[in-house]
């Protein structure tokens, strides 16, 4: 988790002088509770936006937006703590809006936004906005939270972001898998425009089970420049096991931008259709 660029982050708006500060996620009002505290945020919205860095890279960011309730507690509102928690790692990043002037009621509802938390593809986050100072122990909570899941790199809009492109999202191998005679599979895929090696991982399964019955790894050396974007054809020999008929072929590239952590593509060959009715048993058995 990180913030997009570290250029001046602003939270000021007409009628309010405000500054954005780094936060330890442990506001002072936890340790030194105040008697009078503001009410909770209203209408918290989390959206996925895309933002360019000063270097021109494109990143997915969490766009956080909320409004204030129209009650007298805004007189005691000193700021807000914005927290983003990545759920699978428990990593948390916070910033603090520090109000440098007192809020006053005006003809429009107060609205705040922040769009600088960079989020990762295929990750889930909990976003919390806490109004400050935080409530006294046993006081009514004055925060609002929402969870949201960021699409993975196969999503059309995510595919062109810098983190996705770095992991090989623009490569479409268009894998085809064909079953041949004599227990063989022909795998065909399109090479990318980089002189890097690939690995084909074959895993076979029985018809209705998820325990593998055969595994094989095939190494493909780095193509020459004249082979870029060409089809690579590989024939894999299967183990002759009856019922080991469902095959998953996974292609792992080793691009320089992602090394051994690049996006993998896969294709599956299903078992051949079984006839619905068993073969009829003849009325008589021949003796020869």
């Amino acid at each position: 988790l990180r913030l997009l660029d570290h250029r001046a982050l602003v939270c000021s708006q007409p009628g309010l002088n405000c500054t954005v500060k780094n936060s330890t996620c442990l506001d002072d009002s936890w340790i030194h509770p105040r008697n009078l505290t503001p009410s909770s945020p209203k209408d918290l919205q989390i959206q996925l936006h895309f933002a360019h860095t000063q270097q021109g890279d494109l990143f997915p960011v969490a766009h956080i937006e909320w409004t204030l309730q129209t009650d007298a507690s805004i007189l005691y509102l000193e700021g807000a703590e914005l927290s983003v928690l990545q759920l699978n790692t428990n990593e948390r990043l916070c910033v603090r809006f520090e109000f440098l002037s007192k809020l006053r009621h005006h003809h429009r509802r107060w609205r705040f936004t922040f769009s600088h938390f960079v989020v990762d593809p295929d990750q889930e986050y909990e976003v919390t906005v806490h109004h400050l100072p935080k409530p006294i122990p046993d006081g009514d909570p004055n925060h609002q939270s929402k969870n949201f899941l960021v699409p993975d790199c196969e999503h059309a809009r995510m595919k062109v972001t810098t983190p996705c492109m770095s992991s090989g999202s623009l490569w479409d191998p268009n894998i085809t898998v064909e079953t041949l005679e004599a227990h063989q599979l022909r795998v065909s895929f399109t090479l990318w425009n980089e002189s890097t090696h690939y690995q084909i991982l074959l895993t076979s399964f029985p018809h209705m089970e998820n325990h593998s019955c055969f595994e094989h790894m095939h190494h493909i050396p780095a193509p020459r420049p004249e082979e870029f974007h060409q089809r690579s054809n590989v024939t894999l020999t299967l183990r002759n096991l009856k019922g080991c008929c469902r095959h998953q072929v996974q292609i792992q590239p080793f691009f320089s931008s992602c090394l051994n952590d690049c996006l993998r593509h896969s294709a599956t060959v299903s078992c051949p259709e079984m006839p619905d009715t068993p073969e009829p048993i003849p009325d008589y058995m021949p003796l020869w």
Partner: nanobody, 127 residues
Amino acid sequence: QVQLVESGGGLVQPGRSLRLSCAASGFSFDEYAMHWVRQAPGKGLEWVSGISWNSGRKGYADSVKGRFTISRDNAKNSLYLQMNSLRAEDTALYYCAKEKSLGYCSGGSCSDGFDIWGQGTMVTVSS
């Protein structure tokens, strides 16, 4: 123009099944998470189920878990809700809704993050 059109509602006996459909048009359906929300007579909106853009993630309200199944067909720009073991308390107007953002709202109050709603299809569960 951008629209969602629900169908498949009707009168059904308790314990029976019904399948709702939602046809989407006017936006890139395969980029957005979609949801089902219902409103029982005289009650407020209740989120029922949601599904991410590629069906990789699905969520259900506790009241329908194990009975309802959400699915989508991006090639047909369609969202579905298979409702089994229906109960009288499932009687409601069912809306399909598009998430405003490209992400998938997976917790907290989600309904306020939907920007396009259908006109709803009525499901009545009664013997």
